[in-house]
């Protein structure tokens, strides 16, 4: 039967996305139990039946992947999970509309920092994500992002820095003076969905200037 | 069986403010979201705004924004709509509706009149 | 916000003939994820609370008579009676669930002549 309040077994149901990996999460309210058992249903915007997701059905853990059924960006999905108690007390709670495209946070760029006598050079690799082609391939953020550029900062010294920016992979900060270490940092952004990943941040010393010695 | 019940309707002066009621039973209030429709003597349909019980998250038409508030209370299985400032052209039956696109379950209805 | 259109206004059916109310949107209601549009069909009867009759503009209903049945894309749809029971006079509504605020046509009365 129902509790008098749901939440006391269960609270916080949400998507948690990065990358485009979506990751159902939950807590327990104060009357959960760790031998609490929770199974978990999606659905799409404005389809009538919810389905259950095979691998989270009557499990003790408080997430649940649904990358793979959640892998349309375009769609708008839900998802709740039932709780039950080992008493037989039961509570449903469901997630608000969840857009991967407009939720997922991005997380730092996978970069190669290379130092140099007088400059640095620092290389994006591209971000691979879960979300497939039609043909099969895995996109990256670039191919899901048209308006993705980089953002990347070299801290000269406390007062100044030196920008670079751009849709590029291989960026290069020029003049600098050898052996002395800086701190890039390289941020992706997604002006229309109003992005900003956390900072890859990378400590680097330009090489010793041996044509002197 | 899904039943949602209404309540809380009635007389009210020009000025005031109502809060109605819709009762659940059958299902869980936090499975599905939950719409408020109303619906003027003799005419059509407009819809007031959502909530996802669940959440607490909301919806409203522009048109209702800062007059109109929803909420849940999870314990009781029941939906709540507040209106604030009514004035005559308020005069309705309001409905609660079930689920988050298109109803699949309404409520009976509950008469509000506004008047002096 | 997205305007929905009902045509006629009401008509009158002889019992046993085919009914047609047509609705129109003010922009399309094709979504774009599942190619369906987002359209729903309501009966109302007097005194009572509307019944969903129809959704994705062509689903019908769990225990809704397959005389109702509708049809359409974009911003033109249709819902039939395909055979006018005397149960079937009441006040019919579309309704669009592309884009907040969700909005409802104005009604058209069904009556038999």
């Known amino acids: 039967h129902a509790p008098e309040d749901p939440s006391d077994l269960l609270q916080h149901v949400k998507f948690q996305s990065s990358n485009f990996e979506n990751i159902l999460t939950w807590d327990s309210g104060p009357e959960g139990t760790p031998d609490t058992v929770y199974s978990i249903e999606y659905k799409t915007y404005g389809e009538r039946d919810w389905v259950a997701k095979k691998g989270c059905q009557r499990i003790t853990r408080k997430s649940c992947n649904l990358t793979v059924e959640t892998g349309n960006l375009t769609e708008l999905y839900y998802a709740r999970v039932t709780a039950v108690s080992a008493g037989g007390r039961s509570a449903t709670k469901m997630t608000d509309r969840f857009s991967s495209l407009q939720h997922t946070t991005l997380k730092p760029p996978d970069v190669t920092c290379i130092s140099k006598v007088r400059s640095i050079q620092m290389i994006v690799h591209p971000t691979p994500t879960p979300i497939r082609a039609g043909d099969g391939h895995r996109l990256t953020l670039e191919d899901i992002f048209h308006d993705l550029f980089y953002h990347l900062e070299l801290q000269v010294n406390r007062t100044y820095q030196m920008h670079l920016g751009g849709k590029q992979r291989e960026y290069e900060f020029f003049g600098l003076t050898p052996d002395t270490e800086f701190l890039g940092t390289i941020m992706i952004c997604v002006p229309t969905w109003a992005k900003e990943s956390a900072p890859y941040m990378c400590r680097v010393k330009t090489l010793p200037d041996r044509t002197w010695t | 069986e899904v039943q949602l019940v209404e309540s809380g309707g009635g007389l009210v002066q020009p000025g005031g403010s109502l809060r109605l009621s819709c009762a659940a039973s059958?299902?869980?209030?936090?499975?599905?979201?939950m719409n408020w429709v109303r619906q003027a003597p003799g005419k059509g349909l407009e819809w007031i705004g959502e909530i996802n019980p669940s959440t607490g998250t909301t919806t409203y038409n522009q048109k209702f924004k800062g007059r109109a508030t929803l909420s849940v209370d999870q314990s009781k299985n029941t939906a709540y709509l507040q209106m604030n400032s009514l004035r005559a052209e308020d005069t309705a039956v309001y409905y609660c509706?079930?689920?988050?696109?298109?109803?699949?379950?309404w409520g009976q209805g509950t008469l509000v009149t506004v008047s002096s | 916000d997205i305007v929905m259109t009902q045509s006629p206004d009401s008509l009158a059916v002889s019992l046993g003939e085919r009914a047609t109310i047509n609705c129109k949107s003010s922009?399309?209601?094709?979504?774009?994820?599942?190619?369906?549009?987002?359209l729903a069909w309501y009966q109302q009867k007097p005194g009572q609370p509307p019944k969903l009759l129809i959704y994705?503009?062509?689903s019908r209903e769990s225990g809704v008579p397959d005389r109702f049945s509708g049809s359409g894309s974009g911003t033109d749809f249709t819902l039939t009676i395909s055979s006018l029971q005397a149960e079937d006079v009441a006040v019919y509504y579309c309704q669009q669930y592309f884009s907040y605020p969700f909005t409802f046509g104005q009604g058209t009365k069904v009556e038999i002549k």
């Open positions: 922009q399309s209601l094709l979504y774009s994820s599942n190619q369906k549009n987002t």
């Open positions: 509706a079930r689920f988050d696109a298109y109803f699949d379950y």
């Open positions: 059958g299902y869980s209030l936090t499975a599905e979201y």
């Open positions: 994705w503009a062509s």
